[in-house]
Interface confidence: medium
């Protein structure tokens, strides 16, 4: 079986005018999954972001998480990127709607 | 910084159990799952198993009837466990960390461990 | 299973030379899990590139990967005397997850 993931970007405000985005994806199977940042359709560096590791959400499902710090006012220049059983898709950050879901 | 050690037996007898441990330091069980890979001598790499963060385990099904993978967190240990062993699993068992955002390639290494089998 | 080869199986260059290894899948295999890894005479190997053209962390430049689907690459671009090693690739897309048997990159 396939169950592809939710797909959720946050915004959180910290100090000296960046921000932490987070890209959570969530109920998804099965486990094997990519997540990353982007900046400009580019991945970023694997040592400017953080991930959790692919853990089980209690329906079946896995759930998993990547963050990375960015320049307050250039969230249009990033993506989330994911990948999940030959599906794939990118998830945008907005500086307004601070919430942004999508399920494919 | 980044460490993982395997140690056990160097020889263990044909239709014994090989029993592996892999010490880390550096980074959390809780947070890093590991990998078992072996390398029979003068050969290539051929991947065992690995165990995730809360414990669930993935197995090459060519040694899934025999092998066991667990972690103890507060010894900061996992393990490997190869039953019913033949002279062909003689080999240098190496555990590797899994690495976050390296989409499960392995980023930390321990330097190996020979095992023999024989009688 | 997927089946990685190598090729070819051993290559023999000299210093300052550019070294192109070849990992072919038996079926294919996503760009983000086909990762390559060196290893010296006993030592154990390590991460070199991952997800196909990544370098993991204190990779100089001169390495890069590239490719999709079933055929990969990795290009030393120079090489110089420590890049001589066994070179393999490894894909996590399917289970089991399988090595490529490795192509031995050795001084001319």
């Known amino acids: 079986r396939t169950v592809p993931p939710m797909v959720n970007v946050t915004c959180s405000e910290v100090s000296e005018g960046n921000i932490t985005v987070t890209c959570r994806a969530s109920s998804f199977y099965p486990r094997n999954i990519t997540l990353t940042w982007r900046q400009d359709g580019v991945s970023l560096s694997h040592n400017t972001q953080q991930w959790g590791d692919v853990l089980p959400d209690g329906n079946g499902t896995y759930q998993t998480w990547v963050a990375t710090r960015i320049r307050q006012g250039e969230e249009q220049r990033f993506t989330c990127y994911m990948e999940h059983s030959g599906n794939h898709g990118t998830h945008p950050v907005s500086g307004k709607v601070l919430v942004l879901q999508s399920h494919w | 910084q980044v460490q993982l050690q395997e140690s056990g037996p160097g020889l263990v007898k044909p239709s014994e159990t090989l029993s592996l441990t892999c010490t880390v330091s550096g980074f959390s069980l809780t947070t890093y799952g590991v990998h078992w890979i072996r390398q029979p001598p003068g050969k290539g790499l051929e991947w065992i198993g690995m165990?995730?963060?809360?414990?669930?385990?993935d197995y090459n099904a060519a040694f899934i009837s025999r092998v066991t993978i667990s972690v103890d967190t507060s010894k900061n240990q996992f393990s490997l466990k190869l039953s019913s062993v033949t002279a062909a699993d003689t080999a240098v068992y190496y555990c590797a960390r899994k690495g976050h955002g390296y989409y499960y390639a392995m980023d930390y290494w321990g330097q190996g461990t020979l095992v023999t089998v024989s009688s | 299973e997927i089946v990685l080869t190598q090729s070819p199986g051993t290559l023999s260059l000299s210093p300052g030379e550019r070294a192109t290894l070849s990992c072919t899948a038996s079926?294919?295999?996503?760009?983000?899990?086909l990762h390559w890894y060196q290893q010296k005479p006993g030592q154990a190997p390590r991460l070199l590139i991952y997800?196909?053209?990544n370098l993991a962390s204190g990779i100089p430049d001169r390495f890069s990967g590239s490719g999709s689907g079933t055929d990969f690459t990795l290009t030393i671009s120079r090489l110089e005397p420590e890049d001589f090693a066994v070179y393999y690739c490894?894909?996590?897309?399917?289970?089991?997850?399988?090595f490529g048997q490795g192509t031995k990159l050795e001084i001319k």
């Open positions: 490894h894909q996590y897309h399917r289970s089991p997850f399988t």
């Open positions: 079926s294919s295999v996503s760009s983000s899990y």
């Open positions: 997800s196909t053209s």
């Open positions: 165990i995730w963060t809360d414990g669930t385990t």
